[in-house]
């Protein structure tokens, strides 16, 4: 399989609502029309799949209905958003891009984005 460069930010801080967004950019060597994007989480040397979507160029990026990910594509860039994150979800989130069509098949794996999630402090009781 042929290798392809994938770039993503080194660090992202999730919002207080547990939402993190980052851009995954790939150096497409040609005009791919079927692209698969997968987000993987690496923590304690364990790798798990967070979400994945296949899209045809020019169409919307669609994840499964119960996915915690949403995204949009523009050229060779994919804007990914992960929702519902909690402090325990802090970890390295790796973007993997596969160019499925036309041949040849290309695979690119980013270095990962370290997402930090801080659970919001509960509101203190007011004595008014």
């Amino acid at each position: 399989c042929k290798a392809m460069h994938v770039a993503q930010p080194a660090v992202v801080l999730a919002s207080s609502r547990g939402i993190a967004s980052f851009v995954c950019e790939y150096a497409s060597p040609g005009k791919a029309t079927e692209v698969r994007v997968t987000v993987l989480r690496q923590a304690d040397s364990q790798v798990t799949e967070v979400c994945a979507a296949t899209y045809m160029m020019g169409n919307e990026l669609t994840f499964l209905d119960d996915s915690i990910c949403t995204g949009t594509s523009s050229g060779n860039q994919v804007n990914l958003t992960i929702q519902g994150l909690r402090a325990m979800d802090t970890g390295l989130y790796i973007c993997k891009v596969e160019l499925m069509y036309p041949p040849p098949y290309y695979l690119g794996i980013g270095n990962g984005t370290q997402i930090y999630v801080i659970d919001p402090e509960p509101c203190p009781d007011s004595d008014f």
Epitope: C1, E34, T54
Partner: nanobody
Framework: EVQLVESGGGLVQPGGSLRLSCAAS????????AGWYRRQPGKERELVAT???????HYVDSVKGRFTISRDNAKNTVYLQMTTLKPDDTAAYYC?????????????WGKGTQVTVSS
């Protein structure tokens, strides 16, 4: 280790048809780019046809309109329907699956099946 096993080759007369099958020992074909390649006597191995997970198909010019690649994910099998066969189609045909699982790329090959077109 996933294994790909081709079948369906044989001796056929010019103008005849054959259907090659490629069965995978694991359920990787649904996520892979599956393809058929061939090696003709004295030549390099060449791509014949591929099918993507989204069922987009690609054919080398010399087989367009004569060969059809398809897949059955439930059976973990990829097919190559070959019609109007010519002596030039004589070759060993190999099945291939390219893709990745988590951070690991895979590129599996079968051992091949021989197709001979001769009268």
């Amino acid at each position: 280790e996933v294994q790909l096993v081709e079948s369906g080759g044989g001796l056929v007369q010019p103008g005849g048809s054959l259907r090659l099958s490629c069965a995978a020992s694991g359920s990787i074909l649904s996520i892979a780019v599956a393809g058929w390649y061939r090696r003709q006597p004295g030549k390099e191995r060449e791509l014949v046809a591929t099918i993507s997970p989204g069922n987009n198909t690609h054919y080398v010019d010399s087989v367009k309109g004569r060969f059809t690649i398809s897949r059955d994910n439930a059976k973990n099998t990829v097919y190559l329907q070959m019609t109007t066969l010519k002596p030039d189609d004589t070759a060993a045909y190999y099945c291939n699956a390219k893709g990745s699982i988590l951070l690991n790329a895979f590129d599996y090959w079968g051992k091949g099946t021989q197709v001979t077109v001769s009268s």
